[in-house]
């Protein structure tokens, strides 16, 4: 039975040209995390494999950085980066857990969000 839950940064906003950290956390399960995939609308951004480490999609390698932890840092944001992001935790023996984050990239300094997950 899948008992775990995913906590995410939820709905977040950031300024165009800036950076943002996407974070998910899996709790309430003793399942082993074998891999975490980060996707944006069915496009694979990055993989963190427990055995082989981080792999960043060649399409995003200039704007995506691994971490911190199992999170993902998006850099040089554009308005086209607005949308849904998913952290997909592949675990054993539970199976797959998915978290959702909605990112809105704003044109000006009207982006407001707690500094905990934002890089100045």
């Amino acid at each position: 039975m899948m008992t775990g839950t995913i906590e995410t940064t939820g709905n977040i906003s950031a300024e165009k040209g800036g950076s943002i950290i996407l974070q998910c956390h899996l709790s309430s399960t003793t399942a082993q995390v074998t891999q975490v995939n980060w996707e944006q609308q069915d496009q694979l951004l990055a993989i963190c494999n427990a055995d082989l480490g981080w792999h960043i999609s060649p399409s995003f390698k200039d704007r995506v950085a691994p971490g911190p932890g199992l999170g993902l840092t998006l850099q040089s944001l554009t308005v086209n980066d607005t949308g849904e992001y998913f952290c997909i935790y592949h675990t054993y023996p539970d199976g797959t857990y998915t978290g959702r984050i909605f990112l809105e990239v704003l044109e000006s300094s009207v982006a407001e969000h707690g500094a905990r997950f934002q890089i100045p």
Partner: antibody, heavy 121, light 108 residues
Framework: QVQLVQSGAEVKKPGASVKVSCKAS????????MHWVRQAPGQGLEWMGI????????SYARKFQGRVTMTRDTSTSTVYMELSSLRSEDTAVYYC??????????????WGQGTMVTVSS | EIVMTQSPATLSVSPGERATLSCRAS??????LAWYQQKPGQAPRLLIY???TRATGIPARFSGSGSGTEFTLTISSLQSEDFAVYYC??????????FGGGTKVEIK
Amino acid sequence: QVQLVQSGAEVKKPGASVKVSCKASGYTFPAYYMHWVRQAPGQGLEWMGIINPSLGLTSYARKFQGRVTMTRDTSTSTVYMELSSLRSEDTAVYYCARGGRTTWIGAFDIWGQGTMVTVSS
Amino acid sequence: EIVMTQSPATLSVSPGERATLSCRASQSVSSNLAWYQQKPGQAPRLLIYGASTRATGIPARFSGSGSGTEFTLTISSLQSEDFAVYYCQQYVVWPPLTFGGGTKVEIK
């Protein structure tokens, strides 16, 4: 040209170990993942594991964990797959296959010719 | 693990006809799917990667489509050398990377 050449057929007794080699040529050996896949007679393809030839990092299918060891020798561009505690169900053709670059993921574009391992008492 | 299911298990087709092979993933693999061809006594050969990109040297009669969980390999006009077993494979989540059970394309 790019190719993978595997060692010859083996006949082993139950409980023994086998070590199959796969020598790569024609490309930058450390830059691409190497996988091992096996195929029992008349059956489909079964992934066993992967090795990063540059760092030596490995990831094994849970089914084989504790029984399989994948290593590499960068000086000879060779990867090895050792399977221990052999049983009759391990009778199969074992293939090495080149995967994607170690910076990303990819399909298996180059395959070895296969090594037949027969386990019989 | 991601389970790959191929259908049909066997496909009987006449030379010159079109063959359509299906592959379904138990969860999304985006476009990280490959198709391989295997003839008796030979190692598999990569046909398609990225769900729809032909590998080097693969004839244009082979085409792949789909994304997410549903994928198709189409052979537009079967040649005698195309009768073989075809496998799909996801290569985005490991361990383990997983193959479908295969579709045997035989002469009708």
